[in-house]
């Protein structure tokens, strides 16, 4: 008894295709060894037609493939454009030769079944509608017209011109004529189901002079499209249901034991399991829409169906599209924390993975919002300026080439809690979801800046110090000047902080930044932070206001400083207005054109290409002069 198994008998029709699944025992050797499909000859020889090593015979060229699904211990042979010559005995098997483990499969390809010679064939998908054309002679114009469905014994009425309708076709069948043409009538049947498939006869008149026409209606269930995705990656279900359902609510559901459970619909329903990682995007007025799911999990694998109905729920006789999603656990996407925890007033540094082969791609960070159909407005990007409400507390650090970029958010509040996405304008599979949780702080922050209300006087020397605990002793400390294009790390020279020391004096651990002499351009947000190599850690922020010397107090309270931050930003608006104009000039600007939101998330079209410097640590327009010094004590 062979441990390989599959269908013993496969039958199909000329011109159609088959998909033969062969199962193999769950061992590492089996998963990686050669898979083959061969045809048995009279001599007992089995001639390879296709194998997983890339071999494809001439007779299968352009019409067959073999796909291995190691996590399911199966491989699938797909053969298209079948002919009667394909009828025969085959083997699917494993091993370096065709004498390895195998399973016998018999394939029979028949001619298209003979129908009465005048039969008209209509082939439609489930949920669609069909209009059957029934010609007749002029003398039968005044006579009754009808359509009936053939059963074993009789022909059961569907509809006739006296307005009789079979109960199972009420509201679905219409008999009509077009214009003044008295030689043809039509029957339209909508919301087709499998039960509607079969042979029909349309008739005008009675007795031997009646006009009759045979109709074969084939109602096809959509073939599930196979989607093969990596764990932690993302998938887009592109659903094209046609113009007739353009105004109906749309849904995506997953087949369960007895039902298809709705995951998301355009009426606001969303499965909690997909919170923070799903969007539904109406594409156009033709009934097209897409559903994007990020952060794929093993349990997301399964049979999905999209459809349209006013209820936003699956309904028999309405158009559908189906997919079989496989989630490959051998993922190229690194396993990162999906939940990041911060405290109020503190900071988080989020490492976002991207395809290392696409280091020059534009990187983005957006906040998932669940209202409506879900959307994800971009908060920061390598060439997208930081959103105004995140001024002074959000920056993206691109580390070219290492497959990671870092997003830092500080001055956290409980409002920041939620779901965020890392994404690029490159490989869409590398979209990842992070949940940010923010708890109330119960102790002092690790990094503290003094003085806290910082006002520097024009032309003078100004020093701010950042106190850090001993646990950060061995890490690199830095100051950077924040702008809405990033946080530019200021040059520092290390004065002995790296010297080996047995003890660490908690009170004396600080890194200082000195502005000498202070200029108007020095006004703005500054961050003090720690990092280890390319791994960023905690940060804290301070706003430094710059004033001309006055006789009165030089103290400015933080609210004024923040107000001034806004002013400083507005003075820089010239740049951003240019970039907005450039955005508008881009044809098909893609997901980020619409108010910087990820709308058509499935499209990897040209992204928002705002002008200006990149938001990387080294991409600032203003170089810092030697007046900025860091002193480590």
């Amino acid at each position: 008894k062979s441990p390989i198994f599959g269908p013993q008998e496969v039958s199909s029709i000329e011109g159609d295709s088959v998909s033969i699944t062969c199962y193999y025992p769950d061992t590492s050797v089996n998963r990686h060894t050669r898979k083959y499909w061969c045809r048995q000859g009279a001599s007992g020889m089995c001639t390879t037609l296709i194998s997983s090593n890339g071999y494809l015979s001439k007779e299968y060229s352009g019409r067959a493939n073999l796909i291995n699904f190691p996590e399911n211990n199966t491989f699938v042979i797909n053969i298209e454009q079948l002919t009667q010559d394909d009828t025969g005995s085959y083997k699917c098997g494993l091993g370096t030769s065709n004498r390895g483990l195998s399973f016998d499969v018999s394939l029979e390809v028949s001619q298209v079944p003979e129908l009465p010679s005048d039969t008209h064939v209509y082939t439609k998908d489930i949920g669609r509608n069909v209009t059957i054309e029934c010609p007749f002679k002029r003398e039968n114009a005044p006579s009754k017209k009808s359509l009936c469905k053939k059963t074993n014994q009789s022909c059961e009425l569907v509809i006739d011109s006296t307005e009789k309708v079979n109960p199972s076709y009420i509201g679905r069948a219409k008999l009509f004529m077009k214009g003044t043409d008295l030689t043809v009538f039509y029957v339209n049947i909508s919301h087709l189901t499998h039960n509607d498939a079969g042979l029909y006869i349309c008739q005008a008149g009675e007795g031997p002079s009646a006009d009759k026409k045979n109709v074969d209606l084939q109602v096809l269930a959509p073939e599930p499209e196979l989607l093969y995705k990596d764990l932690r990656s993302s998938v887009t279900f592109e659903c094209d249901l046609g113009r007739e359902v353009a105004n109906e609510a749309k849904y995506l559901c997953r087949m369960n034991k007895e039902t298809c459970d709705v995951i998301i619909n355009t009426l606001g329903k969303r499965d909690p399991d997909f919170e923070g990682r799903i969007l539904i995007t109406p594409k156009d007025d033709n009934g097209r829409f897409s559903v994007l799911i990020t952060g794929l999990r093993k349990e997301d694998a399964g049979h999905y169906q999209c459809g349209a109905h006013s209820s936003g729920l699956p309904q028999e006789g309405w158009p559908i599209q189906t997919w079989q999603l496989f989630v490959n656990e051998e993922s190229t996407i690194p396993n990162r924390r999906s939940v990041v925890k911060g405290v109020t007033g503190g900071s988080v540094a989020i490492a976002c993975p991207y395809n290392p082969k696409e280091s020059s791609s534009l990187k983005y960070w957006c906040r998932w919002e669940g209202d409506g159909n879900g959307h994800c407005p971009v908060l920061v990007g390598t060439q997208a300026q930081v959103q105004e409400e995140y001024e002074g507390r959000l920056a993206l650090f691109d580390q070219p080439g290492n497959g990671t970029y870092t997003v830092i958010l500080n001055q956290l509040t409980t409002e920041d809690a939620g779901f965020y996405w890392c994404l690029t304008n490159g490989d869409s599979r590398w979209r990842t979801t992070i949940e940010l949780q923010v708890a109330e702080a119960t102790r002092e922050p690790n990094l503290e800046v003094t003085p806290q209300n910082a006002t520097a006087v024009l032309g003078e020397t100004f020093t701010v110090s950042c106190h850090y605990p001993c646990k950060f002793y061995s890490q690199e400390k830095y100051w950077c000047k924040w702008s809405n294009k990033g946080c530019h790390i200021l040059p520092s020279h290390d004065e002995g902080a790296r010297q080996s020391s047995v003890s660490c004096d908690q009170s004396s651990q600080l890194v200082s930044m000195t502005l000498n002499p202070v200029s108007k351009e020095d006004e703005g947000w500054y961050w003090c932070g720690v990092k280890q190599g390319q791994t960023y850690g905690e940060t804290t922020a301070i706003y430094i206001a710059v004033e001309e010397r006055t006789r009165g107090s030089s103290h400015v309270n933080p609210t004024d400083a923040n107000a001034r931050a806004k002013v400083a930003l507005e003075e820089e608006v010239v740049d951003s207005s240019i970039s907005e104009k450039e955005n508008k000039a881009i044809p098909n600007p893609g997901p980020f054109a619409n108010e910087r939101e990820i709308q058509n998330v499935g499209d990897q079209a040209q992204e928002n290409r705002a002008s200006g410097d990149a938001g990387s640590a080294d991409g600032q327009s203003r170089s810092s002069s030697s007046k900025h010094h860091h002193h480590h004590h």
């Epitope: 008998e9 039958s11 159609d16 295709s17 073939e223 007895e258 399964g302 699956p314 028999e316």
Partner: nanobody, 127 residues
Framework: EVQLVESGGGVVQAEDSLRLSCAAP????????MGWFRQAPGKEREFVAA??????????YYGDSVKGRFTVSGDNAKNTLDLQMKGLKPEDTAVYYC??????????????????WGQGTQVTVSS
Amino acid sequence: EVQLVESGGGVVQAEDSLRLSCAAPGLPFSSSRMGWFRQAPGKEREFVAAIGWSGRSTYRYYGDSVKGRFTVSGDNAKNTLDLQMKGLKPEDTAVYYCAADPDYYGDYRTSGAWRYWGQGTQVTVSS
């Protein structure tokens, strides 16, 4: 409520034939695969045969002990399933269960892979 209803069971002599039928009117959609299992007293449920549909192609699967003797057929539009059993042996005595819609990934020979089940029909083959 999904119901699979088997019929056609009975008592026959060895080498006789019998035809089992299964109707699944309550399935929420057309099943892509339906099958037969059997369970003899004190034994595990055993895979007998299955049929799968895709487009206009049909796939038939048989358990090793019935290959060549049993033929599975059905209509996926109507969710009906038949099992023609010829050359019956006393060891074919069991309760025969109809099953529908297995997990796409699962080994269809294991009962755990199938979603819907009938109540079963008794087949007794006397020697």
